[in-house]
């Protein structure tokens, strides 16, 4: 039985040209994490394998950095980076867990303005 849960950063915003860390955390299970795949809609961004380490898709190499941990850092953000991101945890013996993050990339002034009104 799959008992684990994925905690994510949820809905996040960042400013154009900046960077953001996408982070997921698997909890409530003793299953071994064998691999984490990061996807943006229908594109494979990166894979972190327990044995082989990180593989970043060549088309994203300039703007995607591995880590911290099993997370992923997106750099030089553009408005086109707005959308859904998925962390897919492959575990043994549980199977697959999936987490979802929605990233909105805003023009600099909008992002700064919005930040003033965030609830702590």
């Amino acid at each position: 039985m799959m008992t684990g849960t994925i905690e994510t950063t949820g809905n996040i915003s960042a400013e154009k040209g900046g960077s953001i860390i996408l982070q997921c955390h698997l909890s409530s299970t003793t299953a071994q994490v064998t691999q984490v795949n990061w996807e943006q809609q229908d594109q494979l961004l990166a894979i972190c394998n327990a044995d082989l380490g990180w593989h970043i898709s060549p088309s994203f190499k300039d703007r995607v950095a591995p880590g911290p941990g099993l997370g992923l850092t997106l750099q030089s953000l553009t408005v086109n980076d707005t959308g859904e991101y998925f962390c897919i945890y492959h575990t043994y013996p549980d199977g697959t867990y999936t987490g979802r993050i929605f990233l909105e990339v805003l023009e600099s002034s909008v992002a700064e303005h919005g930040a003033r009104f965030q609830i702590p």
Epitope: Q35, E39, Q43, L44, I47, D51, S59
Partner: antibody, heavy 118, light 107 residues
Framework: EVQLLESGGGLVQPGGSLRLSCAAS????????MHWVRQAPGKGLEWVSG????????SYADSVKGRFTISRDNSKNTLYLQMNSLRAEDTAVYYC???????????WGQGTLVTVSS | DIQMTQSPSSLSASVGDRVTITCRAS??????LNWYQQKPGKAPKLLIY???SLQSGVPSRFSGSGSGTDFTLTISSLQPEDFATYYC?????????FGGGTKVEIK
């Protein structure tokens, strides 16, 4: 240099058994998932079975489930396919393959021919 | 099981031609789609992985595109050594499945 060398193929009667081996060298065998893929004469490619890097997880095509068993010995850098209750339709060249990240096959062996015939 | 439908099953082309092969999945497979080249009597060779990533050592005239259900392999300028059979393969879920193949022949 990555090398995968299959052996154990040959002629066997229907209902018989064979054990294929794949000796791996040139890479850290224990870090990679490994698969078997077959190709019947003049036909396309058909995935047969796969095994995780530590051998803890295996999967099979429906056509071989219950008859074939995949295993590996990481201390010997060797992948195996035990084939029982063989049928004429199992006649094919069997390739062992390295599967980084479980997503693509980057290296294939040269293949070993299994012929099931009376 | 996910079915992979490749087209055309064969084509005739000349050296220098631009060749396009398509592959359609029966359900969305994100970008978990690979392309292989096989010559008679030889093992397949990886060309493109994850829909659009060029495998190391493969000439840049080969390219892949697509996501979801529809994918394309393009050879921008066909060379004599490119006459072979090409297969797509999905690795989104087991059982892994291959397309039926496209044989590229000399016109």
């Amino acid at each position: 240099e990555v090398q995968l060398l299959e052996s154990g193929g040959g002629l066997v009667q229907p209902g018989g058994s064979l054990r294929l081996s794949c000796a791996a060298s040139g890479f850290t065998f224990s870090s990679y998932a490994m698969h078997w893929v077959r190709q019947a004469p003049g036909k396309g490619l058909e995935w047969v079975s796969g095994i995780s890097s530590n051998g803890g997880s295996t999967s099979y095509a429906d056509s071989v489930k219950g008859r074939f068993t995949i295993s590996r010995d990481n201390s010997k850098n060797t992948l195996y396919l035990q084939m029982n209750s063989l049928r004429a339709e199992d006649t094919a060249v069997y390739y062992c393959a390295r599967v980084p990240y479980g997503v693509w096959i980057d290296y294939w062996g040269q293949g070993t021919l299994v012929t099931v015939s009376s | 099981d996910i079915q992979m439908t490749q087209s055309p099953s064969s084509l005739s082309a000349s050296v220098g031609d631009r060749v396009t092969i398509t592959c359609r999945a029966s359900q969305s497979i994100s970008s978990y789609l690979n392309w292989y080249q096989q010559k008679p009597g030889k093992a397949p060779k990886l060309l493109i992985y994850a829909a659009s990533s060029l495998q190391s050592g493969v000439p840049s005239r080969f390219s892949g595109s697509g996501s979801g259900t529809d994918f394309t392999l393009t050879i921008s300028s066909l060379q004599p050594e490119d006459f072979a059979t090409y297969y797509c393969q999905q690795s989104y879920s087991t059982p892994l499945t291959f397309g039926g193949g496209t044989k590229v022949e000399i016109k």
